[in-house]
Amino acid sequence: LPTLPWSVCQEEWGDCLPSDPDLDPVGTITNETKSSAELYFLKTVLQQKDGIEDGLG
């Protein structure tokens, strides 16, 4: 099966936890760390015109 794009952290995402626990064998999860799935969703939503309406926040 192909790797899902949010299964692996991208360097530019900063603090990130791989969604696949096998990719995080030492257990570096912290409250400040977002999973790659969460970050992928947030980054993609931000980049898509249809993602978040202008002026939100």
Partner: nanobody, 121 residues
Framework: QVQLQESGGGLVQAGGSLRLSCAAS????????MGWFRQALGKEREFVAG????????YYADSVKGRFTISRDNAKNMLYLQMNSLKSEDTAVYYC??????????????WGQGTQVTVSS
């Protein structure tokens, strides 16, 4: 700003289904990208699924992909999570959350109180 309240949790047998709902107060619900998270006892919060403001984009964590479906009804200010083929490892408190963009960086800033889902084997 949006206030969120989850419902629909409960006890279900492994292999069963549940539908979680998240009611949002306020007329601006349709402006927010939304997500579902879960936190099992003694574990960290886990992103489950996300959906954009219009419902045209959805994303899922690997652990639930193909089993869970996130959807929304902006006319009713509701967010949903349909959970099928439940496993014992799905047992957790489930939270809905809303995304805001502050300084160009999106984040889940609005949270509900959570609803408990227990899957018995």
């Amino acid at each position: 700003q949006v206030q969120l309240q989850e419902s629909g949790g409960g006890l279900v047998q492994a292999g069963g289904s549940l539908r979680l709902s998240c009611a949002a107060s306020g007329r601006t619900f349709s402006r927010y990208a939304m997500g579902w998270f879960r936190q099992a006892l003694g574990k960290e919060r886990e992103f489950v699924a996300g959906i954009n403001w219009s419902g045209s984009m959805t994303y899922y964590a690997d652990s639930v992909k193909g089993r869970f479906t996130i959807s929304r009804d902006n006319a009713k200010n509701m967010l949903y999570l349909q959970m099928n083929s439940l496993k014992s490892e799905d047992t957790a408190v489930y939270y809905c959350a809303g995304v805001t963009v502050v300084g160009g960086a999106p984040a889940f800033d609005y949270w509900g109180q959570g609803t408990q889902v227990t899957v018995s084997s």
